[in-house]
């Protein structure tokens, strides 16, 4: 129980097209040191949705202040959802490494389904 766990509490989230989707993720520990990334899909073909360390992700906002000391909440919100955003999203903890960070642990995944925009 002491080792870091990646918690993605929602197994499934359904959002209407045009709305924002909140994907929740938290860590149970600050150790090991290293960034959090969000991906859509798993394996070699997964798509990077958000990288805590670097990059520009205009549709993604973090739900809590990630720079805040002792922050364990790495939930994100994705704006203006379209059917193309459907899929399973994984919150992944990386361990700081040299030269590259190493994947440490992944959440169980949250399946995002997109409903037609209400008329």
């Amino acid at each position: 129980e002491d080792e870091l766990q990646v918690i993605q509490p929602e197994k499934s989230v359904s959002v209407a097209a045009g709305e924002s989707a909140t994907l929740r993720c938290a860590m149970t520990s600050l150790i090991p040191v290293g960034p959090i990334m969000w991906f859509r899909g798993a394996g070699a073909g997964r798509e990077l949705i958000y990288n805590q360390k670097e990059g520009h992700f205009p549709r993604v906002t973090t739900v809590s202040e990630l720079t805040k000391r002792n922050n364990l909440d790495f939930s994100i919100s994705i704006s203006n959802i379209t059917p193309a955003d459907a899929g399973t999203y994984y919150c992944v903890k990386f361990r700081k490494g040299s030269p590259d960070d190493v994947e440490f642990k992944s959440g169980a995944g949250t399946e995002l389904s997109v409903r037609a925009k209400p008329s």
Epitope: E1, P9, K11, A26, T28
Partner: antibody
Framework: QVQLVQSGAEVKKPGSSVKVSCKAS????????ISWVRQAPGQGLEWMGG????????NYAQKFQGRVTITADESTSTAYMELSSLRSEDTAVYYC?????????????WGQGTTVTVSS | EIVLTQSPATLSLSPGERATLSCRSS???????????LDWYLQKPGQSPQLLIY???NRASGVPDRFSGSGSGTDFTLKISRVEAEDVGVYYC?????????FGGGTKVEIK
């Protein structure tokens, strides 16, 4: 051995509020999901909402939205459920239950229940 | 929200008989990770509910092996191979795939 111990029975007047506590002992608190489930006399089980203390914010069933507030105090490993604008139909046994937040293990630990009676 | 429908409403059995309880969901409870997010609970008279089966078919700790869960997607079954007097109570299914978490209406098991 994890245990959930709930506060005692309450008798309330219509229109008032009730706050029920659920203290966890013997295990990790912040990363588990605490749900509140109620059971009216002779009726089935009804999920009211739940909280994972590590996130701080709660999820609520739409039926109770605006009338129920679920909170958690990590320092005392205690969860709370407050229900306002009480009516006679809120007379029920209120349970807290613990589950791992991924849902893999079901609600494996339940409190003993708190009877709330709403009567004028 | 996901609606769970249980049948029958009441099951009256003699000790040693086999019990079959059904739970049907209004939408699939099968996640892309391969798990079915359906649990079974037993509430004995005057007691808090207790977990019997999680993820559709996994027995919770301490649950006798006469209880078994099966099914996938929208149709689930709880079987009690040989009913005993201590098995009386109301059995509920629950879906944990998405919030709001919902329960079935329950099946009451009684001994003749």
């Amino acid at each position: 051995q994890v245990q959930l111990v709930q506060s005692g029975a309450e008798v309330k007047k219509p229109g008032s509020s009730v706050k029920v506590s659920c203290k966890a002992s013997g295990g990790t608190f912040s990363s588990y999901a605490i749900s509140w489930v109620r059971q009216a006399p002779g009726q089935g089980l009804e999920w009211m909402g739940g909280i994972i203390p590590i996130f701080g914010t709660a999820n609520y069933a739409q039926k109770f939205q605006g009338r129920v507030t679920i909170t958690a105090d990590e320092s005392t490993s205690t969860a709370y459920m407050e229900l306002s604008s009480l009516r006679s139909e809120d007379t029920a046994v209120y349970y807290c239950a613990r589950a791992k937040p991924r849902g893999d293990y079901g609600m494996d630990v339940w409190g003993q229940g708190t009877t709330v009676t709403v009567s004028s | 929200e996901i609606v769970l429908t249980q049948s029958p409403a009441t099951l009256s059995l003699s000790p040693g008989e086999r019990a079959t309880l059904s739970c049907r969901s209004s939408q699939s409870l099968l996640h892309s990770n391969g798990y079915n997010y359906l649990d079974w609970y037993l509430q004995k008279p005057g007691q808090s509910p207790q977990l019997l089966i999680y993820l559709g078919s996994n027995r919770a700790s301490g649950v006798p092996d006469r209880f078994s869960g099966s099914g996938s997607g929208t149709d689930f079954t709880l079987k009690i191979s040989r009913v005993e007097a201590e098995d009386v109570g109301v059995y509920y299914c629950l879906q944990a795939l998405q919030t709001p978490i919902t329960f079935g209406g329950g099946t009451k098991v009684e001994i003749k």
